[in-house]
């Protein structure tokens, strides 16, 4: 983890780097190493892909250990084959508003995902996709023999879109903060984004934290219930502790994970709250990060990696967030 | 963020009349009804009236004399009135979307007293 | 005038399974009552849980299922959570209104 001992590197040849990522000397100038992208963890020895800008950042002085890759102030960002600077928003499709910042792109949806429960006034609640209409619209169908208008008993009618306000005025700052992003990782730990104003200076800043969808170990397939096909949430297993680059948090907690699905749908958190977590390291150095930790999960066909980004990013994010 | 928010007088006097305005957020009064239910002290939740999403309205039979319920849809409101007054309306009101009555008000309450 | 009747209190271990019911004083519950189910943690807003007797709000747990039972409303909480205990209150629709009942405090042992 840090430079202190002897250069130690693997007997075989140089990695193989994916597309696109840098191979690079370790932060001791020892080993070659695939260099770490925007958003991933780094420490000293895995350092940040320097051709793309990219440096690792410790945060506060107490977290020397690990980092995350961060783009050096006023880095551009490519989305979608266009480069934007630093600070500029643009509308991505018609149902997202995004943000550039250092090298990181927040976008929050224009579209309403508020959820419909049955009741007289709308008994078969559905989200439909209209012509020419971006944002998906509430349509309450009827039943088929109602003739009497009342609260049950309209006629089909097409429901008016809108939109929650994704904004709040404060003190002469619209304030904005994206949703946190879906987390890097589907199994074990990862890291969850979002771009924000919501401070004193009314500055748009990046914030980070720490999340893990599902232990990579755990087979939760094997859970499944004969004829089900999914576990939005598993049982709640024995606590635990995190373990961060060597480094173990100082608790234990029984944290909830999401589940998995057989059917082919994704199975992500719907509910969080971030909350700060001590890690201890094995030279006893203490850091705390913060971390994401789930409250709902849900099932869904929008997975990571779909055709529609931007529908994939919509679905994927993290919202509810407590914190 | 779907919010509802009470809002009216703390005190009336007995044969009063009172007046309630619930002002949403984050949804559309033509979208989802809007429902105005109490809870006396130490008792249990009581439903008085719901105005539609297309403005039809439906009131608690034991009241129905003394409601009105109007709403304001460019404005986000819904109003409740309640005439005469007793001390034994004193209550916590609260207004909460149609649908399952998933969002509620944090609620307002009124003491009937003279 | 109807009635609509839950158990005053009911008590449960973490990890159990306990069921609210729901009684309609004029007869069977049905899907036309389109039960609801609220609930209300000490010093904490009201919520809706389940509206249109089974369906859940989003922020719902999947531990928490709405059904009918013998002619009555039921909520059912399976895996039991400290964080369970509160008041649940469930209303059923007449055609021209809503009655609530009169609410069930459900508590978590330990």
């Known amino acids: 983890q840090n430079c202190s001992g002897p250069c130690r590197c693997p007997d075989e040849p140089a990695p193989r780097c994916p597309a696109g990522v840098s191979l690079v000397l370790d932060g001791c100038g020892c080993c070659r190493v695939c260099a770490k992208q925007l958003g991933e963890l780094c420490t000293e020895r895995d350092p940040c892909d320097p051709h793309k800008g990219l440096f690792c950042h410790f945060g506060s002085p107490a977290n020397r250990k690990i980092g995350v890759c961060t783009a050096k102030d006023g880095a551009p960002c490519i989305f979608g084959g266009t480069v934007y600077r630093s600070g500029e928003s643009f509308q991505s499709s018609c149902k997202y508003q995004c943000t550039c910042l250092d090298g990181a792109v927040g976008c929050m949806p224009l579209c309403s995902m508020d959820v419909r429960l049955p009741s007289p006034d709308c008994p078969f609640p559905r989200r439909v996709k209209l012509p020419g209409k971006c944002c998906e619209e509430w349509v309450c169908d009827e039943p088929k023999d109602q003739t009497v208008v009342g609260p049950a008993l309209a006629a089909y009618r097409l429901e008016d879109t809108f939109g929650p306000d994704p904004t709040m005025i404060r003190a002469n700052c619209l304030v904005q903060t994206t949703e946190w992003s879906a987390c890097s990782k589907t199994c074990g730990m990862g890291i969850s984004t979002r771009v924000t104003n919501d401070n004193a200076s009314c500055r748009l800043e990046k914030q980070s934290r720490l999340c893990m969808v599902r232990p990579c170990e755990a087979d939760l397939e094997e859970n499944i219930k004969k004829g089900k096909k999914c576990i939005r949430t598993p049982k709640i297993s024995k606590p635990i502790k995190f373990e961060l680059s060597g480094c173990t948090s100082m608790k234990t907690y029984r944290a909830k994970f999401c589940g998995v699905c057989t059917d082919g749908r994704c199975c992500t958190p719907h509910r969080t709250t971030t909350l700060p977590v001590e890690f201890k390291c094995p030279d006893g150095e203490v850091m705390k990060k913060n971390m994401m930790f789930i409250k709902t999960c849900a099932c869904h066909y929008n997975c990571p990696g779909d055709n529609d980004i931007f529908e994939s990013l919509y679905y994927r994010k993290m919202y509810g967030d407590m914190a | 963020e779907v919010t509802l928010k009470e809002s009216g007088p703390v005190l009336v006097k007995p044969t009063e009349t009172l007046t309630l305005t619930c002002t949403v957020s984050?949804?559309?009064?033509?979208?989802?009804?809007v429902h105005w239910i109490r809870q006396p002290p130490g008792k249990a939740l009581e439903w008085l009236a719901v105005?539609?999403?297309?403005?039809?309205?439906d009131y608690n039979a034991a009241f129905m004399s003394r409601l009105t319920i109007s709403k304001d849809t460019s404005k986000s409101q819904v109003v409740l009135t309640m005439t005469n007054m007793d001390p034994v309306d004193t209550a916590t009101y609260y207004c909460?979307?149609?649908?399952?009555?998933?969002?509620w008000g944090q609620g307002t309450t009124v003491t009937v007293s003279s | 005038e109807t009635v609509v009747t839950q158990e005053p209190s009911l008590t449960v271990s973490p990890g159990g399974t306990v069921t609210l019911t729901c009684r309609s004083s004029?007869?069977?519950?049905?899907?036309?009552?389109?039960a609801n189910w609220v609930q209300q943690k000490p010093g904490q807003a009201f919520r809706g849980l389940i509206g249109?007797?089974?369906n859940r709000a989003p922020w719902t747990p999947a531990r928490f299922s709405g059904s009918l039972l013998g002619g009555k409303a039921a909520l059912t909480l399976s895996g039991v959570q400290p964080e369970d205990e509160a008041e649940y209150y469930c209303?059923?629709?007449?055609?021209?209104?809503?009655?609530f009942g009169g609410g069930t405090k459900l508590t978590v042992l330990g």
């Open positions: 004029i007869g069977a519950v049905t899907t036309s009552n389109y």
């Open positions: 209303a059923l629709w007449y055609s021209t209104h809503y009655v």
């Open positions: 249109g007797t089974s």
């Open positions: 909460a979307r149609d649908g399952g009555f998933d969002y």
């Open positions: 984050g949804f559309s009064l033509s979208t989802f009804g």
């Open positions: 105005i539609w999403r297309r403005g039809g309205t």
